[in-house]
């Protein structure tokens, strides 16, 4: 349904508050280095213009596309070339090339200072002094650091952020009330950002078909009572929503997401029995709740899959007539029966089934050829099951910190060319799979663990893509979306790697380490561990453990000393010498 003025249409649909917030997010995700005040000024100008179009849709420029309007506005930024370099060249292009150009320049790891949390009283004063600016600043800071953050979900985070300050700034103990809430929002926000980044990577690097396959599998697990046609409709709509958000069309995305939530709630009887509570909530909470809703119970007495997908004489005929639909039906039927499988495993099974049909349906006796296709699934299912079992045992034995360290060593040996901060960040996140998933019963472990690992490995892939240094990482990241984790798991020690030259400065520590939080101190130690492995890739677990134990004791001793700095200087030299001897450096 075409509208005379797209900007007026979206303003009316979304309302002024959401319109302004979404435009701010869009601008901050594109121009990640621009000061807050500049963005606010641009957003206000766009909003005023939108209001003129609401008043008269035939007014000048109101018929222009949102990309044209927003792109023109972004290109008025005076310091574009000084701040962004070649991104300024985007402004010489016409739509749609200009928007594509802006999208290509989104930076997953922008050179921005770490967000330091002020004192609680300072934050509460700022919140009370100008609530609107305070909340806009939150949107801006998150959006510029997470250029693919799911915009309608960021509105939900901002709503919770506001609620936390509204409640806690009146509390007797403001800090005790506020800090845990902010920690929770930060952790959930990072997780949400990473999950969305995988969706965008899936769409942008592997195409709509890959995303739709993922969505069929996930929604079929979640809504096993829904008919295939219903799941297909939801997948089509969900794909549109995420395509829009990943493409920077945030107003359309938020509008369509609201429509999808409305549709799901109006049709919950034919979708899932678990939606009732979600559908009673206000819009932002409703959409979030639906996205996180637990899997519905599987229908009783589902027939064997073999009847339709192996034994039927029409398998090849049906496949030939509508390949993707037939494969979609296979994926739907398999996924709704297997909430205990990861989505990526289900997609591997569907790929195996597709490859078998492609080969067998062109053979002289198709049925004879594909009759044993389900037997080929067994090793594919057992591989992640065994891996999760082994790693959960290791996690339970070591605890999170030491489990992370084991992964740090493992991954540094696999891909030692990758930058140390990236290896530390990714391995720490990989290690969190233990506390996140190993507590679950067997039936929930694989979907929790393997789908989480897909999200974390995508972080490695997007960070590596910015500055590629390892052919092995590139290969695992680009060959197959669903086989990324098995690809990385299969990597052995990189025998071609030339060890890094020893640099004493890397292992020099100062008294400032004593004032760091436990998390920051762990990161310091883990950074040193990665560097050790890069210097001595053939070091044994025992050697590395001995050095790390000595290092922990050294930090503990010097942090207790009266003259900490002298202790770090003198004991540090001894530690470096002892470590070199222990590792034969």
């Amino acid at each position: 349904d075409a509208h005379k003025s797209e900007v007026a249409h979206r303003f009316k649909d979304l309302g002024e508050e959401n319109f302004k917030a979404l435009v701010l997010i869009a601008f901050a995700q594109y121009l990640q280095q621009c000061p807050f005040e500049d963005h606010v000024k641009l957003v206000n100008e766009v909003t005023e213009f939108a209001k003129t179009c609401v008043a008269d849709e035939s007014a000048e420029n109101c018929d222009k596309s949102l990309h044209t309007l927003f792109g023109d506005k972004l290109c008025t930024v005076a310091t574009l070339r000084e701040t962004y370099g070649e991104m300024a060249d985007c402004c010489a292009k016409q739509e749609p090339e200009r928007n594509e150009c802006f999208l290509q320049h989104k930076d997953d790891n922008p050179n921005l200072p770490r967000l330091v949390r002020p004192e609680v009283d300072v934050m509460c004063t700022a919140f009370h002094d100008n609530e609107e600016t305070f909340l806009k600043k939150y949107l801006y800071e998150i959006a510029r650091r997470h250029p693919y953050f799911y915009a309608p979900e960021l509105l939900f985070f901002a709503k919770r952020y506001k609620a936390a300050f509204t409640e806690c700034c009146q509390a007797a103990d403001k800090a005790a009330c506020l800090l845990p809430k902010l920690d929770e929002l930060r952790d959930e926000g990072k997780a949400s950002s990473a999950k969305q980044r995988l969706k965008c990577a899936s769409l942008q690097k592997f195409g709509e078909r890959a995303f739709k396959a993922w969505a069929v599998a996930r929604l079929s697990q979640r809504f096993p009572k829904a008919e295939f046609a219903e799941v297909s409709k939801l997948v089509t709509d969900l794909t549109k929503v995420h395509t829009e958000c990943c493409h920077g069309d945030l107003l359309e995305c938020a509008d369509d997401r609201a429509d999808l939530a409305k549709y799901i709630c109006e049709n919950q009887d034919s979708i899932s029995s678990k939606l009732k509570e979600c559908c009673e909530k206000p819009l932002l909470e409703k959409s979030h709740c639906i996205a996180e809703v637990e899997n519905d119970e599987m229908p009783a007495d589902l027939p064997s899959l073999a009847a339709d997908f192996v034994e039927s004489k029409d398998v090849c005929k049906n496949y030939a007539e509508a390949k993707d639909v037939f494969l979609g039906m296979f994926l739907y039927e398999y996924a709704r029966r297997h909430p205990d499988y990861s989505v990526v495993l289900l997609l591997r099974l569907a790929k195996t089934y597709e490859t078998t049909l492609e080969k067998c349906c062109a053979a002289a006796d198709p049925h004879e050829c594909y009759a044993k296709v389900f037997d080929e699934f067994k090793p594919l299912v057992e591989e992640p099951q065994n891996l999760i079992k082994q790693n959960c045992e290791l996690f339970e034995q070591l605890g999170e910190y030491k489990f992370q360290n084991a992964l740090l060593v493992r991954y540094t040996k696999k891909v030692p060319q990758v930058s140390t901060p990236t290896l530390v960040e990714v391995s720490r996140n990989l290690g969190k799979v233990g506390s996140k998933c190993c507590k679950h019963p067997e039936a929930k472990r694989m979907p929790c663990a393997e789908d989480y690992l897909s999200v974390v490995l995508n972080q490695l892939c997007v960070l590596h893509e910015k500055t590629p240094v390892s052919d092995r990482v590139t290969k695992c990241c680009t060959e197959s979306l669903v086989n990324r984790r098995p690809c990385f798991s299969a990597l052995e020690v990189d025998e071609t790697y030339v060890p890094k030259e020893f640099n004493a400065e890397t292992f020099t520590f100062h008294a400032d380490i004593c004032t760091l939080s436990e998390k920051e101190r762990q990161i310091k130690k883990q950074t040193a561990l990665v560097e050790l492995v890069k210097h001595k890739p053939k070091a044994t677990k025992e050697q590395l453990k001995a050095v790390m134990d000595d290092f922990a004791a050294f930090v503990e001793k010097c942090c207790k000393a009266d003259d900490k700095e002298t202790c770090f200087a003198e004991e540090g030299k001894k530690l470096v010498a002892a470590s070199q001897a222990a590792l034969g450096l």
């Epitope: 029409d314 005929k317 049906n318 496949y319 030939a320 007539e321 509508a322 639909v325 492609e358 062109a362």
Partner: nanobody, 123 residues
């Protein structure tokens, strides 16, 4: 919009041959499976043959296997059915068809179809 136009039907004696063509437009022909179905007077639709998008997979109904040959030209967006050793029971209106989103696979009443071309086998 999807358009399918069959041609090549006519009256033929038993044992004779015909070649049906179907010109397709309005959809991605080269990535779509295609089907020939037929309908004899007073009967329902009967599946005749299926060909995959890349022509690698071809299936025939038992009643026509060995006598009919389905083929396609993706460059020309055209589907063919070569019918040899025709029998009186092959008399029907022949339709080319393709899957319509939202329909059930094999539910040919719901597929996109052309207007059909009449084939009459009679001496």
């Amino acid at each position: 919009q999807v358009q399918l136009q069959e041609s090549g039907g006519g009256l033929v004696q038993p044992g004779g041959s015909l070649r049906l063509s179907c010109a397709a437009s309005g959809f991605a022909f080269s990535t779509s499976g295609m089907v020939w179905v037929r309908q004899a007077t007073g009967k329902g639709l009967e599946w005749v043959s299926t060909i995959s998008d890349d022509s690698r997979i071809i299936r025939y109904a038992d009643s026509v296997n060995g006598r009919f040959t389905i083929s396609r030209d993706n460059a020309e967006n055209t589907l063919y059915l070569l019918m040899n050793s025709l029998k009186p029971e092959d008399t029907a209106v022949y339709y080319c068809a393709t899957y319509r989103a939202g329909s059930r696979i094999g539910s040919y009443e719901d597929y996109y179809r052309g207007q059909g071309t009449q084939v009459t086998v009679s001496s």
